[in-house]
């Protein structure tokens, strides 16, 4: 025998107390699949959360975070305060990255600068609180005679003949 509740579409619940008729989900609740015996209460995006997608009779609301905060967790279950680039969030609020570390985002932790020498390279551009170091060629590549590339000839100014 087929379960009579299987005929109830999404957006309804199968009412056991009324000979298993399909009743619509009340406002601010939903059922995303057919054959359900209950409706789920819609998520409410309050406080630091804001509504990204309204709840409907067949799907839950979706939240994101108000400006100055970003989502964490599955389905944006939490909002965490943004910091500036060059900072990280601690229990005491946003703190500047320590020397030798950087953060190029408004979230996350400060990470150590890349150690160029581990790859046998030199530092081309120094790191800052906001940016990682830029590694250049290895010191050996910079020694005289090491390069097989012919350097370009110096440009001559127009109107001057060679001395």
């Amino acid at each position: 025998l087929q379960d009579p509740c299987s005929n109830c579409p999404a957006g309804t619940f199968c009412d056991n107390n009324r000979n298993q008729i399909c009743s619509p989900c009340p406002p601010n609740s939903f059922s995303s699949a057919g054959g359900q015996r209950t409706c789920d209460i819609c998520r409410q995006c309050k406080g630091v959360f804001r509504t990204r997608k309204e709840c409907s009779s067949t799907s839950n609301a979706e939240c994101d975070c108000t400006p100055g905060f970003h989502c964490l967790g599955a389905g944006c279950s939490m909002c965490e305060q943004d910091c500036k680039q060059g900072q990280e969030l601690t229990k005491k609020g946003c703190k500047d990255c320590c020397f030798g570390t950087f953060n190029d985002q408004k979230r996350g932790i400060c990470r150590p600068w890349t150690n160029c020498s581990l790859d046998g390279k030199s530092v081309l551009v120094n790191g800052t609180k906001e940016r990682d170091v830029v590694c250049g060629p290895s010191p050996a590549d910079l020694s005289p005679g090491a390069s097989s590339v012919t350097p370009p000839a110096p440009a001559r100014e127009p109107g001057h003949s060679p001395q």
Epitope: N17, P26, P27, N28, S29, D40, I41, Q44
Partner: nanobody, 120 residues
């Protein structure tokens, strides 16, 4: 931690009325369906009804004698019981859930209950 506190139970004569209250502390009812269950001595727990977003759903025994309402400003839910009978004697429990109705679900939180005795 959410705590639900029922009140308003007591002794009432058959045919009389009683209004039970359920107050929440630690969290508002805002995002929960609120329901009532009851358990008579030596019997299984029975579903009374659920309230959510202006809609109420009731168990199949009460024949329009029971009404659930909600006062958001007081963070309180009520169960109005009229034309009471001896068989309505039970401990009445308030419960909250993210499901509507609660007829077939285990609530997320439930109170300690209040005793209603219908007797002459």
């Amino acid at each position: 931690e959410v705590q639900l506190l029922e009140s308003g139970g007591g002794l009432v004569q058959p045919g009389g009325s009683l209004r039970l209250s359920c107050a929440a502390s630690g969290r508002t009812f805002d995002n929960y369906a609120v329901g009532w269950f009851r358990q008579a001595p030596g019997k299984e727990r029975q579903y009374v009804g659920t309230y959510w977003s202006g809609y109420a759903h009731y168990g199949d025994f009460e024949n329009n004698r029971f009404t659930i309402s909600r006062d958001n400003s007081k963070n309180t839910v009520y169960l109005q019981m009229n034309s009471l009978r001896a068989e309505d004697t039970a401990v009445y429990y308030c419960a909250i859930s993210l499901k509507y109705p609660m007829a077939t679900v285990t609530p997320d939180y439930q109170g300690q209950g209040t005793l209603v005795t219908v007797s002459s």
